[in-house]
């Protein structure tokens, strides 16, 4: 799997999108997990609603939310109040039974300032010899969520 870099700004919210084939993954719940070390397990952070038909409902675990557009085939994860220690390698997963298919590998990068990232033209895309193959960098520098957009109280 290729790895996509999503760059966010400390203190703000970051939206990560994971596109998938809606027919292939029809009826499957999704999850967002954090990789523990290079070869370690992927620790579940949050998963979509237990009832697949309600996957569009946003579910929260702490400052992380997940919602699934099952028709359009896009899983969206929101990391609220992003902090440097949130940086790391994550995965979007499609669940079936006790198994999980990786939809996308995501490297979350937390920048100190929205002006600190390079322009897309300056970004380096590593070749196949590098550990992250055919990397794609998403400048998901986004504003903080407005108060009214945050479900209160957050449900997990």
């Amino acid at each position: 799997h290729n790895t996509t870099v999503f760059q966010g700004v400390a203190g703000q919210s970051l939206q990560v999108s994971c596109p998938y084939d809606s027919m292939k993954h029809w009826g499957r719940r999704k999850a967002w997990c954090r990789q523990l070390g290079e070869k370690g397990p992927c620790q579940r952070v949050v998963s979509t609603h237990n009832l697949w038909l309600l996957s569009f409902l946003r579910r929260w675990n702490g400052s992380t939310a997940i919602t699934d557009d099952t028709l359009g085939g896009t899983l969206t994860i929101t990391l609220r109040n992003l902090q440097p220690h949130d940086a790391g390698l994550y995965q979007c997963q499609s669940l079936h039974g006790s198994e999980a298919d990786t939809l996308r590998k995501v490297l979350v990068e937390v920048l100190a300032d929205p002006l600190d990232h390079r322009d897309a033209g300056d970004l380096w895309f590593p070749g196949e010899s590098e550990s992250f193959e055919d990397a794609h960098v998403e400048h998901s520098i986004s504003r903080s969520l407005l108060e009214g957009e945050i479900p209160f109280p957050p449900t997990s």
Partner: antibody, heavy 120, light 107 residues
Framework: EVQLQQSGPVLVKPGASVKMSCKAS????????MNWVKQSHGKSLEWIGT????????SYNQKFKGKATLTVDKSSSTAYMELNSLTSEASAVYYC?????????????WGQGTSVTVSS | DIVMTQSHKFMSTSVGDRVSITCKAS??????VAWYQQKPGQSPKLLIY???TRHTGVPDRFTGSGSGTDFTLTISNVQSEDLAEYFC?????????FGGGTKLEIK
């Protein structure tokens, strides 16, 4: 064995600029952030900034923004820091340090330091 | 900026003793705290990260604890080679900041 080999000591005049290097070996350069830390004589440590050689992402300590510029050359696994408009306050030892992409980790390897003396 | 305060600039101990070095953050930093050891004339070395995880190769007499705002580095069975300055650092939020350091003196 992980090694961060830094360039030698420099003596510069006030107002001048200096560019120091940090050559990494013993690991995959693009898999780790490179940080720079300042240690003034007999004092504590100050984080200057970090650069991700993989994505090009850079974060600076606001205190050093406009004063320090971080770059990398992936082909030679070398990180650089340029300091401009130097004053006596910039006299210090500067360390490059490696940090895992995972935000739960700290700066696990340090270079031997580059001593900068600003004097007329 | 988060201020990391190491209240003791110097601490004196004897070989074989147990010593605790403390560090206080000006606001909650969760467990995003590291401890470094710097021996005279050398670069700092990582001892502990994520408040309590020992870095590879660090002797188990070094133990880190704490979360939120109060953190402790404990050295049990102090050895003469532990003569050094110890710094705490938070990496919970930008800019990353260090404590002022605690110099450990061996009696």
């Amino acid at each position: 064995e992980v090694q961060l080999q830094q360039s030698g000591p420099v003596l510069v005049k006030p107002g001048a600029s200096v560019k120091m290097s940090c050559k990494a070996s013993g690991y995959k350069f693009t898999d780790y952030y490179m940080n720079w830390v300042k240690q003034s004589h007999g004092k504590s440590l100050e984080w200057i900034g970090t650069i991700n050689p993989y994505s090009g992402g850079i974060s600076y300590n606001q205190k050093f923004k406009g004063k320090a510029t971080l770059t990398v050359d992936k082909s030679s696994s070398t990180a650089y820091m340029e300091l401009n408009s130097l004053t006596s306050e910039a006299s210090a030892v500067y360390y490059c340090t490696r940090r895992n992409w995972d935000g739960r980790y700290a700066m696990d390897y340090w270079g031997q330091g580059t001593s900068v003396t600003v004097s007329s | 900026d988060i201020v990391m305060t190491q209240s003791h600039k110097f601490m004196s101990t004897s070989v074989g003793d147990r010593v605790s070095i403390t560090c206080k953050a000006s606001q909650d930093v969760s467990t995003a705290v590291a401890w470094y050891q710097q021996k005279p004339g050398q670069s700092p070395k990582l001892l502990i990260y994520w408040a309590s995880t020992r870095h590879t190769g660090v002797p188990d007499r070094f133990t880190g604890s704490g979360s939120g705002t109060d953190f402790t580095l404990t050295i049990s069975n102090v050895q003469s080679e532990d003569l050094a300055e110890y710094f705490c650092q938070q990496y919970s939020s930008y800019p990353f900041t260090f404590g002022g350091g605690t110099k450990l003196e061996i009696k």
